[in-house]
Amino acid sequence: QSGPLPKPSLQALPSSLVPLEKPVTLRCQGPPGVDLYRLEKLSSSRYQDQAVLFIPAMKRSLAGRYRCSYQNGSLWSLPSDQLELVATGVFAKPSLSAQPGPAVSSGGDVTLQCQTRYGFDQFALYKEGDPAPYKNPERWYRASFPIITVTAAHSGTYRCYSFSSRDPYLWSAPSDPLELVVTGTSVTPSRLPTEPPSPVAEFSEATAELTVSFTNEVFTTETSRSITASPKESDSPAGPARQYYTKGN
């Protein structure tokens, strides 16, 4: 045996975004003839020696990062990529809106705004029909992302989630769907790009805006955040209301 055994794959079916009390199955897949699978929940010191974990009803405590490996003889494989299992519906849904409106001409600009009454500092935007249906929705770690130079590829149904960086696997319920209609030439819908994480401050009422510029199918993002304190909010799970204004680079 030269080198380590190749890593298995780990996926959540039907999705890694799981509403509370709904079922989900985690499946670790290695090559044929594996002697032993080990499925681990990270940062909890717990594991199961099986390839499949069926969760009949999602709980907050089951949200988190998972990883699996397998053993052949005395050799262990490289670990799978980590799977982030997210519990949704933990908090009330945010609202998603389009500015100036959900109908936009091809080449025009539109801003998607995800607004929450809680003190969340993280937002996730999900576009239906993503070609990787079991992948987490894209997470946008900064609050301002207008879509510049819209193309027909941006047409579709969007939902957003909000959550706190303190509990990154406990998400709100999804917003009501927003149908973005782009008038102009027909283009095959494409996925939204992924933004790498960057820490941001907490706040009590926030607006997340999505901005994506496309140039020869390469995208950039421009970000800013405008936050208004809302002293009357006393049920914010992220703590007391504070006022911040931050602007991305």
Partner: antibody, heavy 123, light 111 residues
């Protein structure tokens, strides 16, 4: 209450063999991972081997691989460690320890330990 | 040589606070595995003191606390008492070969 009692230790010559036993009581033995952990005189703890509840999942430290064999008999609530080709550096107190378990999950720590049995390898 | 690194000894006067560090690597503590602590009183078997970085089993006084950050962890003991004199071991798991790993142990002396 949970109890783990080791036995079988003693003096053995280098190259010799010894079989340690650990008698478990006070819990459903077959549901738990158990390990052997040793401590050389005046030294620290060293994990030796672990075995899953059914006996099919076994793991060994590199220092004993190929020489030691862990096994269990759930009907007898017993854990075993067959030690062959013993060396002077295997001299230690050998503890059996239970891994914590909750619902379907096993945990990577030891919640109960036996009192240990001393193995001395010397000519 | 142990996979996890602890100071060989620490000491403190009764009533004082002492901390014991435990340093690992990206394949154990830094790989998402928790750190657990055991107390071994002279002539006895080890006893679980802290599990899951910072949790105390029932019966363990709240003078004992644990924390973890990155690839290291620490055990803090406040209000030192004579009966705390013992060896303390940290333990975690290593992803490379899925083995259980210990620190070399720290002898606590109460002055």
């Amino acid at each position: 209450q949970v109890q783990l009692v080791e036995s079988g230790g003693g003096l053995v010559k280098p190259g010799g063999s010894l079989r340690l036993s650990c008698a478990a009581s006070g819990f459903s033995f077959g549901d738990y991972y158990v390990s052997w952990i040793r401590q050389a005189p005046g030294k620290g703890l060293e994990w030796v081997s672990a075995i899953g509840g059914s006996g099919s999942a076994v793991q060994y430290a590199e220092s004993v691989k190929g020489r030691f064999t862990i096994s269990r008999d759930n009907a007898k609530n017993s854990l075993y460690l067959q030690m062959n080709s013993l060396r002077a550096e295997d001299t230690a107190v050998y503890y059996c320890a239970r891994h914590y378990r909750e619902f379907r999950w096993h945990y990577y720590y030891f919640d109960y330990w036996g009192q240990g049995t001393l193995v001395t390898v010397s000519s | 040589q142990s996979v996890l690194t602890q100071p060989p000894s620490v000491s403190g006067a009764p009533g004082q606070r002492v901390t014991i560090s435990c340093t690992g690597s990206s394949s154990n503590i830094g790989a998402g595995y928790d750190v657990h602590w055991y107390q071994q009183l002279p002539g006895t078997a080890p006893k679980l003191l802290i599990y899951g970085n910072s949790n105390r089993p029932s019966g363990v006084p709240d003078r004992f606390s644990g924390s973890k950050s990155g690839t290291s962890a620490s055990l803090a003991i406040t209000g030192l008492q004579a009966e705390d004199e013992a060896d303390y071991y940290c333990q975690s798991h290593d992803l490379g070969a899925h083995v259980w790993v210990f620190g070399g142990g720290t002898k606590l002396t109460v002055l």
